[in-house]
């Protein structure tokens, strides 16, 4: 009978024993202790740092390769052994029981081959598992490395942010403390100022009371003085009459009074009043008065302002009469009045300066070295000579001068009524390159306007200016 047994020897090596009648064959296989069985494999059981696991896997792979190599060598040896050493027995067996022995040997060979194939397959499986595990571990390692980097970066960023915030906080705390200190100081000084002001107010109140008393006294004194002056004048008058009946005393006193009458701002300036502001001027050869704004700063001062545009607060679409006598507020938008300008510019040669402002912060001027107006019978026709300045080389007031036109007095050279078309009173041509009395348009609405505040040779046809000032001064100032 045949008996086929597989067992382990005392030191754990696998052995295959074949019993055939009185013959016993024992095969010792190479050691495979380093190969773990698939059941002992625990996936993802990472117990320590990945790099050590990885080295371990490499080592195990090397051992497995060695085992495979050993198995292969052993199989070759087995084949050789069977071929060489079994020849004798084969002969004997052939003699005794050829068929039976052959069957046994075939069975043994088959079993051995099966066993080897099984072992090889298992080894291949283990190798594949090890490779898979290695790959998986490598990926995990890479992921861990990336996430560690990411976390480290986040921690660094947060740390930096925290530091920044701490710095900022410290700075703000310091600032708040500083401000508190400042506020305390300021409050103290304000309180002191308030106390001082209260003292000052009470002082001023008493001064005012004193002045009021003095004023009452002065008024009384003034009345007395006026009466005395009147009496004296009468006495002088009678004395003069007695001495020289042919000479009128009135002339002497009128001449004295004329010294405090100002025909224009140049006279105001020359009298020592050199502050910008509104002054009362008197028409030449008349007692009629007019309030005018005097510019005492521009180009040496002494300028009588005859027109100003600055904010659109005054309507310039006015009648002939209104342009004749003037309108508006001398310290703001206004037209001084054609009649006064006609009269004053016919006394002596005057210069005209026109100052312009656009909406982009630019300023320019036109200066006419000789300027005067004709009288009302000639429609206050404008006369200009000698243009200089930065608001255009060509005059934006048409030359020769045109008559003045208003909505109710059409004296222009257009088939239309320019004053009606373009609004405002002006020395229109047909209708011409300027109109400083046009509609006032605010910023961003000041372009593409037919009827705005126009000075063609500075800003072109459709541009409406931000501000204008027309002022006059004697040429010999």
């Amino acid at each position: 009978y045949n008996n086929f047994r597989r067992s382990m020897d005392s030191i754990g090596r696998r052995q295959y024993q074949v019993q055939h009648g009185s013959c016993s064959y024992t095969f010792l296989l190479p050691e495979t202790d380093n190969c773990r069985s698939p059941g002992s494999y625990v996936p993802n059981a990472v117990q320590r740092d990945a790099p050590l696991d990885y080295d371990d896997s490499v080592q195990r792979l090397q051992v497995l390769e060695n085992i495979m190599e050993n198995n292969t060598q052993w199989l070759i040896k087995l084949e050789n052994y069977i071929q060489d050493n079994m020849k004798k027995e084969m002969v004997e067996m052939q003699q005794n029981a050829v068929q039976n022995q052959t069957a046994v040997m075939i069975e043994i060979g088959t079993n051995l081959l099966n066993q080897t194939a099984e072992q090889t397959r298992k080894l291949t499986d283990v190798e594949a598992q090890v490779l898979n595990q290695t790959t998986r571990l490598e990926l995990q390692l890479l992921e861990h490395s990336l996430s560690t980097n990411k976390l480290e970066k986040q921690i660094l960023d947060q740390t930096s942010e925290i530091n920044k915030l701490q710095d900022k906080n410290s700075f703000l705390e310091k600032k708040v403390l500083d401000m508190e200190d400042k506020h305390i100081v300021q409050l103290r000084s304000i309180k002191e100022e308030k106390d001082q002001l209260q003292v000052l107010v009470s002082k001023q109140n008493s001064i005012i009371e004193e002045l009021e008393k003095q004023l009452v006294t002065a008024t009384v004194n003034n009345s007395v003085l006026q009466k005395q002056q009147h009496d004296l004048m009468e006495t002088v008058h009678s004395l003069l009459t007695m001495i020289s009946p042919s000479k009128s005393p009135k002339d002497t006193f009128v001449a004295k009074e004329e010294q405090i009458i100002y025909r224009d701002c140049a006279e105001v300036f020359k009298s020592g009043l050199t502050t910008n502001g509104i002054y009362t001027l008197t028409f030449p050869n008349s007692t009629e008065e007019i309030k005018a704004y005097c510019d005492m700063e521009t180009s040496g001062g002494g300028w009588t302002v005859i027109q100003r545009r600055e904010d659109g607060s005054v309507d310039f679409q006015r009648t002939w009469k209104e342009y004749k006598v003037g309108f508006g507020n001398p310290s703001g938008e206004h037209w001084l009045g054609n009649e006064f300008v006609f009269q004053v510019t016919n006394q002596q040669p005057y210069v005209l300066k026109i100052h312009l402002k656009d909406w982009e912060g630019n300023e320019a001027y036109s200066l006419y070295e000789h300027f005067y107006l004709s009288g009302e019978e000639l429609n206050y026709r404008i006369h200009l000579k000698g243009l200089t300045g930065t608001a255009g080389k060509i005059s934006s007031i048409s030359q020769p001068g045109n008559d003045f036109s208003t909505k109710d007095a059409d004296n222009d050279k257009c088939i239309c009524k320019c004053s009606q078309m373009l609004t405002g009173g002006w020395w229109f041509d047909a209708c011409g390159p300027s109109n400083l009395n046009g509609m006032y348009y605010p910023q961003r609405q000041n372009t593409n306007k037919f009827n705005g505040i126009k000075w063609y040779y500075w800003k072109g046809s459709g541009y409406s200016l931000k501000g204008t000032t027309m002022m006059i001064r004697p040429a010999d100032f």
Epitope: C416, Q420, C431, N448, F450, Y456, S461
Partner: antibody, heavy 121, light 107 residues
Framework: QVQLVQSGAEVKKPGSSVKVSCKAS????????MVWVRQAPGQCLEWMGY????????GYNQKFEGRVTITADESTSTAYMELSSLRSEDTAVYYC??????????????WGQGTLVTVSS | DIVMTQSPDSLAVSLGERATINCKAS??????VAWYQQKPGQPPKLLIY???TRDTGVPDRFSGSGSGTDFTLTISSLQAEDVAVYYC?????????FGCGTKVEIK
């Protein structure tokens, strides 16, 4: 005699630009404003803008603001109108015309022969 | 923008008869109105400005009138060469605007 001669017809793709020229002769180019007016098929006349060749000042119809640019070359007495971001609705005859007055954009006394601009993909 | 509304859209008149075209402005334009004549394939031609002034070389059969918001162009005795489209135009304020035209034909 006073004459305005415009450039020839143009066919343009949507989104592109067109530049039409207008050469003036028979008068002093800088003495009058030049306007551009267009006439789409079956539509009203439409004022696009003007240029004052004396100082280069321009004014545009808000409808075309940002798309139209009017320029002038004094040396050649030529005005130009460029319209960008063309669309099919811009298909029209474009005219240049002279204003009667330098200082104001009044009425238009001399016209160019017109330039047909077709916008088609 | 000021809207200029022309009426009628078209007009058929016998030769030698009067043709009247109206134009209404959406707001007061004073007398800042011009009239143009446009024949097929030609640019517009100025006829009237400042509502009633004929341009140089324009026959006296053409006349304009009106102020404020209502304006009229009259052809006193229609001639064959007057067949055209007529446009009114306001230049009182920016942007200048045009009517959409009145086509005049011979009946």
């Amino acid at each position: 005699q006073v004459q305005l001669v415009q450039s020839g017809a143009e066919v343009k793709k949507p989104g592109s630009s067109v530049k039409v020229s207008c050469k003036a002769s028979g008068y002093s180019f800088t003495d009058y404003n030049m306007v551009w007016v267009r006439q789409a098929p079956g539509q009203c006349l439409e004022w696009m803008g003007y240029i004052d060749p004396y100082n280069g000042g321009t004014g545009y119809n808000q409808k075309f603001e940002g798309r139209v640019t009017i320029t002038a070359d004094e040396s050649t007495s030529t005005a130009y109108m460029e319209l960008s971001s063309l669309r099919s609705e811009d298909t029209a005859v474009y005219y240049c015309a002279r204003t009667r007055d330098r200082y104001d954009v009044w009425y238009f006394d001399v016209w160019g022969q017109g330039t047909l601009v077709t916008v088609s993909s | 923008d000021i809207v200029m509304t022309q009426s009628p859209d078209s007009l058929a008149v016998s030769l030698g008869e009067r043709a009247t075209i109206n134009c209404k402005a959406s707001q007061d334009v004073y007398i800042a109105v011009a009239w143009y004549q446009q024949k097929p394939g030609q640019p517009p031609k100025l006829l009237i400005y400042w509502a009633s002034t004929r341009d140089t070389g324009v026959p006296d059969r053409f006349s304009g009138s009106g102020s404020g918001t209502d304006f009229t162009l009259t052809i006193s005795s229609l001639q064959a060469e007057d067949v055209a489209v007529y446009y009114c135009h306001q230049y009182s304020s920016y942007p200048p605007t045009f009517g959409c035209g009145t086509k005049v034909e011979i009946k």
